[in-house]
Structure formats: structure tokens, C-alpha cells
């Protein structure tokens, strides 16, 4: 539209903005590495950091791995979004006995109320079925409550409604993928770890707690026991260990009871963008070892500029045990540029790059 021309020209003259013809507005140009949260950003607040797939931007502004719902007994309740983790919950027909951040460490099947008990509250993803004693005299023949006499309050002591435990129920108490049978006390009343002996005669502890060693009477040496692939974080919460399942990652440190698994790029690759306990983007290491690469003097004379290797390849040099095993990487964005002046003026050592001490520090 002709009337838009002056506005468009003014906008184009501002390097920090661009003109969007679709919305006929001047838009703020997000800085490198940040991406717009809307079609036509107006201010820096409308730009955000872009995390890799399966990572989200946490409250501290860090790219953090979304939890995985890949276990058989979990389903995805909410997807992994740019600013929030995926949320998992137990499959229908199961409830969560040990919850962890954004997921559940242990799911169990809902109990079936045994004979003489009826369902007071059906089971949910968070809670087991709650049963209560069926009142005597009540039978399916009762067409309506008025036709069925309630016993007088003193006749039978009414038991407090509780989730049934295996002692009074034939309901399955197995996790979906097997494992040790766990007394299905209410999740909030778990006083012993799965598979541990009865807690009778011991001080009871918090949900999910189990001792580091058999817990002596009155001893404080009991810590919370997280499920496999979870660790106890500094806040005392069970948190999912990061996954190294991406093709370009390998495990550097395993998942331990009090620390996450740590992932690193495969040999021959380098981390271009980090993530908590992992690397969000690995790229092939872009410099060949001195003795296998093209001579820098030759390159300097030609003033060559060359690009990063295509996805899944190494720089053009003879394979070495270290760089020969890199798989396809996720979008390498390293550009390479020969600094001809540096090549000409710096001393060029004849030896290969020197390795550091075994500590690397």
C-alpha cells in the first residue's frame, strides 16, 4: 500500500528492525541466537533463547532436558514445550506411589476392593482406590437408599476409609514392569523402601526413604531412595538424570544416588552449546591434527576460506582413533576461517599439539 511506504522506509533504515509486509508493521529484529515468541516482535522481551528439541528453557534461563515418558507404565500428560518440561503420569489404571519432578518414579495398579468393601473413591493417576466397608444389609436388590435400612450408628464400628493393602486384598501390587512386591499403603504413608523388610520396630521415615545401610534403631543414617535413573538433588527431590541417548553423546559419569548422569560429545566432536550435565549441540571437531591436515603455509598462500564439514563428516584429514568414530551430528554451525596473517607470522611448531595432564586441568 502506498500509504505504508514512508513507514516501511523508516523501518528499513533501522538495522535493529525490519518491516513485515504480512502484518504491515515494523518489527524488532531479535539478536543472533534468540528467536521471536510472536510473528512481529516489538521489544527484546518478545525474543527468547531457542533450545534444542527435547530441551526446555528453565526459570534460570538454562536449556534443560525434558523428562522422558518412555517407560511402559508412563504416559505423557503434557508435551515438552519451549518453557516447560514434558510432564508424565501413570498409565490409566495405575497410580503414582513415588512421585518425582514432572514424572513418577514408581507406578502401581489400582487396588480392587475385596469382598465386603466397596469403592469410596476410584483410583486416579495420583491416588490409589479408596475402599470402605459395605454397610450390612445393603445389597444390589436395594432399588433406592430409602428401601435399604442403614444400621444404627452403634451397631457396627465404621472403619475409616483407607486404600486397601495386600493383607486385605487380592489386588495386584506389581509395577507394570515387574519388580518387588510393595505393600500398597497410601503413597503418603510409605515407610519402607520396596523390597525392604517390615518397618516394624524402626523409626518410620518420609515417603520413599530407605537407609544407606540397614538403618539402626534411632539412627539418622537414612536417606531418601530414588528410583533408577533418578537422583536426589540438593533440594532433596528425586530428579531425572539426563539421558545420553542422542547419537552424538556418550556417558561420561553414570547416574548416582546424589548426582545426575553426565553426558559429553563423542570422541572427535566438541560441545558448541552446553546444557546442564550434558551438551545441547555437538559438532565435529573442526581442526585436523597438525600432521594430518593441509599445511597451514599452503593454505595461507591461497588465503583459503572453507566451511565446516557437512553433517556427519570430519574435517578433511586422515582418520585418527580419536576423530574417526563421530556419528552424524546435530546441525554443525561452526564456520571455519583460515587466519592467513596468524599463519604467516606465528611460529609454527613441528610437534603435534601437546596433550595435557590426565586430569585435563
Amino acid at each position: 500500500f502506498p500509504q505504508d511506504r514512508p513507514f516501511e522506509d523508516t523501518c528499513r533504515g533501522n538495522p535493529g528492525h525490519y518491516y513485515d509486509k504480512a502484518v504491515r508493521r515494523c518489527c524488532y529484529r531479535c539478536p543472533t541466537g534468540l528467536f521471536p515468541t510472536q510473528q512481529c516482535p516489538q521489544r527484546p522481551a518478545d525474543c527468547r533463547k531457542q533450545c534444542e528439541p527435547d530441551y526446555y528453557l528453565d526459570e534460570a534461563g538454562r536449556c534443560t532436558a525434558c523428562v522422558s515418558c518412555s517407560r511402559d507404565d508412563l504416559v505423557e500428560k503434557m508435551p515438552c514445550a519451549w518453557n516447560s518440561s514434558r510432564v508424565c503420569e501413570c498409565q490409566p489404571g495405575m497410580f503414582c506411589a513415588v512421585s518425582v519432578v514432572n514424572s513418577c518414579a514408581r507406578c502401581f495398579f489400582h487396588s480392587v476392593c475385596p469382598a465386603g468393601m466397596i469403592v469410596k473413591f476410584p483410583g486416579t493417576a495420583q491416588k490409589n482406590t479408596v475402599c470402605e466397608p459395605a454397610s450390612p444389609g445393603v445389597s444390589p436388590a436395594c432399588a433406592s437408599p430409602e428401601n435399604c435400612k442403614e444400621p444404627s450408628s452403634g451397631t457396627i464400628p465404621q472403619a475409616k476409609p483407607t486404600p486397601v493393602s495386600p493383607a486385605t486384598s487380592n489386588a495386584s501390587t506389581m509395577p507394570l514392569r515387574g519388580g518387588t512386591r510393595l505393600a500398597q499403603e497410601a503413597a503418603s504413608k510409605l515407610t519402607r523402601a520396596p523390597g525392604s523388610p517390615s518397618s516394624v520396630g524402626r523409626p518410620s521415615s518420609d515417603p520413599g526413604l530407605s537407609p544407606t545401610q540397614p538403618c539402626p534403631q534411632g539412627s539418622g543414617d537414612c536417606r531418601k531412595q530414588c528410583e533408577p535413573d533418578y537422583y536426589l538433588d540438593e533440594a532433596g527431590r528425586c530428579t531425572a538424570c539426563v539421558s545420553c541417548s542422542r547419537d552424538d553423546l556418550v556417558e561420561k559419569t553414570p547416574c548416582a544416588w546424589n548426582s545426575s548422569r553426565i553426558c559429553e560429545c563423542r570422541p572427535g566432536m566438541i560441545c558448541a552449546t552446553s546444557a546442564t550435565n550434558s551438551c545441547a549441540r555437538c559438532v565435529p571437531y573442526p581442526i585436523c591434527a597438525a600432521e594430518t591436515g593441509t599445511k597451514p603455509q599452503d593454505m595461507a598462500e591461497k588465503d583459503t576460506t572453507f566451511e565446516a564439514p557437512p553433517v556427519g563428516t570430519q574435517p578433511d584429514c586422515s582418520p585418527t582413533p580419536e576423530n574417526g568414530e563421530a556419528p552424524a551430528s546435530t546441525s554443525p554451525t561452526l564456520s571455519s576461517l583460515v587466519d592467513s596473517q596468524a599463519s604467516k607470522t606465528l611460529p609454527i611448531p613441528t610437534s603435534a599439539p601437546i596433550a595435557l595432564s590426565s586430569t585435563g586441568k
Epitope: 561420561k252 553426565i262 553426558c263 559429553e264 560429545c265 563423542r266 570422541p267 566432536m269 566438541i270 560441545c271 552446553s274 546444557a275 546442564t276 550435565n277 550434558s278 551438551c279 545441547a280 555437538c282 571437531y285 581442526i287 597438525a290 591436515g293 597451514p296 593454505m299 580419536e322 576423530n323 571455519s336 576461517l337 583460515v338 587466519d339 596468524a342 599463519s343 606465528l346 611460529p347 609454527i348 611448531p349 610437534s351 603435534a352 599439539p353 601437546i354 596433550a355 595435557l356 585435563g360 586441568k361
Partner: nanobody
């Protein structure tokens, strides 16, 4: 034991320039490849540039054409020249030795030296 000290940071206006230095000690020869990484406020550790022992250089896309890395092997020093600085270059800059070996992990910022703060603001 390898120790690095970064210096040369400061406050500069958009379009301005700085020269960062990284002085290394503990190397037995001319030294390995060296890398510069940076961490902007609230962001992850990001690779900026690498220089090989024989002076070949590599840059991440966002700094290509604006930053220049060089080294003086005699003084065990690596330099990073920052030109045409933009607000998004604001970060703490760190150098790291032998990145092929040491920077495969998720965080190569702050493991060898304290870093030097670069702030680009009008």
C-alpha cells in the same frame, strides 16, 4: 598443572572493540589447540573460536567476520580481538586448553580460569 588467566574485558559501546588475552602456564611446549568460550547472563556456555597449535582458526557463525583469534606461542598467550561488538556479545569470556579433549562435555566455561567480563551497552 595448566592454569589460565583471562583479561582485557570491559564496558564498551555497540560497535566498539576490545582485545582479550589468555595467558597460560603449565604447558611443556608451544601448547595445544586453544578455544574461547563465553557465557551470557542466564545462558549456556557457548563455543566462540578455536586456534590450533599452528595457527589455524575457526569461528562460530555469530562472530565470524567480527572476531579474530591469534596466539603468541613464545609468550604462551592467546588473543581474541572483538570488533563491531553488539549487546548480544555481552558475556563472560573464558579460554580453554586442548578443546578436542577437554570441551566434549557440556560446560567448558570457568574450569581453567576466572574469565573476563565483556559488557556491550550504550
Amino acid at each position: 598443572e595448566v592454569q589460565l588467566v583471562e583479561s582485557g574485558g570491559g564496558l564498551v559501546q555497540p560497535g566498539g572493540s576490545l582485545r582479550l588475552s589468555c595467558t597460560a602456564s603449565g604447558f611443556t611446549d608451544d601448547g595445544p589447540d586453544m578455544a574461547w568460550y563465553r557465557r551470557a547472563p542466564g545462558n549456556e556456555c557457548e563455543l566462540v573460536s578455536i586456534i590450533s597449535a599452528d595457527g589455524r582458526t575457526y569461528y562460530t557463525d555469530s562472530v565470524k567476520g567480527r572476531f579474530t583469534i591469534s596466539r603468541d606461542n613464545a609468550k604462551n598467550t592467546v588473543f581474541l580481538y572483538l570488533n563491531s561488538l553488539q549487546p548480544e556479545d555481552t558475556a563472560v569470556y573464558y579460554c580453554a586448553p586442548d578443546p578436542r579433549r577437554n570441551c566434549r562435555g557440556g560446560d567448558c566455561c570457568g574450569n581453567w580460569g576466572p574469565g573476563t567480563q565483556v559488557t556491550v551497552s550504550s
